[in-house]
């Protein structure tokens, strides 16, 4: 019996508008009906929560209204989008998957996605 595996891309480049998207996929060892997905940012040895959402299998993924994340789910795959990123937010973003219900609980953690954010160059002033 192998432990739950979580896969995510190694590297993602954010768009010029500070939006980064990546897929988090997990191989479930059980028949979960309730799943929690958390995005964590690891900088040095500090780990902080970026956003989290719990969803019922077959239903949509819903983050809190003030969250910088949005996402959609399809089976054991979650499409995550993080918005409002700036160059200082460049770092390793880890996808954590928890099978919450029914028991037993299972934990799975991806290796992390290195998100690179480049602040856009300010537009030069133009005279008309």
């Amino acid at each position: 019996c192998k432990a739950m595996h979580v896969a995510q891309p190694a590297v993602v480049l954010a768009s010029s508008r500070g939006i980064a998207s990546f897929v988090c996929e997990y191989a479930s060892p059980g028949k979960a009906t309730e799943v929690r997905v958390t995005v964590l940012r690891q900088a040095d040895s500090q780990v902080t929560e970026v956003c989290a959402a719990t969803y019922m299998m077959g239903n949509e993924l819903t983050f809190l209204d003030d969250s910088i994340c949005t996402g959609t789910s399809s089976g054991n795959q979650v499409n995550l989008t993080i918005q409002g990123l700036r160059a200082m937010d460049t770092g390793l973003y880890i996808c954590k998957v928890e099978l919450m219900y029914p028991p037993p609980y299972y934990l799975g953690i991806g290796n992390g996605t290195q998100i690179y954010v480049i602040d856009p160059e300010p537009c030069p002033d133009s005279d008309f």
Partner: antibody, heavy 119, light 107 residues
Framework: QVQLVESGGGVVQPGRSLRLSCAAS????????MHWVRQAPGKGLEWVAV????????HYADSVKGRFTISRDNSKNTLYLQMNSLRAEDTAVYYC????????????WGQGTLVAVSS | DIQMTQSPSSLSASVGDRVTITCRAS??????LNWYQQKPGKAPKLLIY???SLQSGVPSRFSGSGSGTDFTLTISSLQPEDFATYYC?????????FGPGTKVDIK
């Protein structure tokens, strides 16, 4: 700094009830799974129960299922363990512990509170 | 449920000795394995998390290795303050089981 302080232990007769509390401070309480772990005199560590985040999901050891209830009040940063139908084998030091945000290890423990079930 | 076993259950060693404790899970737990040290009358203290990561403030003589089902805690040079009981624990799936412990005492 992170602090966990248990209270509510004491001597109780078999079949009676007791409620333990764990006051947490120094971190965003609602972002963490919170656990109870116990240790009978001269014995090893035994995981008792966990309650996740918003309190909707809870899991228990078979030895306490149906008798113990774990709960939390995120507005008060407090964890609880309601222990009913207590037995002599529930005699132990009870610790609350914070599960790490990433891999769930117990980086922070309370000092423990002793529950003695005796007639 | 995942069962955790530890060996040896106790050992006697001298200051300066290299000590190795093994922990085995009844099924794969990836790297979700933690090691704790406990002294009489005290709460357990985290030493190693995620199989091989040293907890902040823990001396570098402690190290952990392994993944899947087999794990090891090594103390490279035993110090007087290291005489204690050591527990492994899995944080992969409920119930979050502990090993039975290994008591390290003075030879």
């Amino acid at each position: 700094q992170v602090q966990l302080v248990e209270s509510g232990g004491g001597v109780v007769q078999p079949g009676r009830s007791l409620r333990l509390s764990c006051a947490a401070s120094g971190f965003t309480f609602s972002s963490y799974g919170m656990h109870w772990v116990r240790q009978a005199p001269g014995k090893g560590l035994e995981w008792v129960a966990v309650i996740w985040y918003d309190g909707n999901n809870k899991h228990y050891a078979d030895s306490v299922k149906g008798r113990f209830t774990i709960s939390r009040d995120n507005s008060k940063n407090t964890l609880y363990l309601q222990m009913n139908s207590l037995r002599a084998e529930d005699t132990a030091v009870y610790y609350c512990a914070r599960g790490d945000i990433l891999t769930g290890y117990y980086g922070y423990w309370g000092q423990g509170t002793l529950v003695a079930v005796s007639s | 449920d995942i069962q955790m076993t530890q060996s040896p259950s106790s050992l006697s060693a001298s200051v300066g000795d290299r000590v190795t404790i093994t922990c085995r899970a009844s099924q794969s737990i990836s790297s979700y394995l933690n090691w704790y040290q406990q002294k009489p009358g005290k709460a357990p203290k985290l030493l190693i998390y995620a199989a091989s990561s040293l907890q902040s403030g823990v001396p570098s003589r402690f190290s952990g290795s392994g993944s899947g089902t087999d794990f090891t805690l090594t103390i490279s040079s035993l110090q007087p303050e290291d005489f204690a009981t050591y527990y492994c624990q899995q944080s992969y799936s409920t119930p979050f089981t502990f090993g039975p412990g290994t008591k390290v005492d003075i030879k």
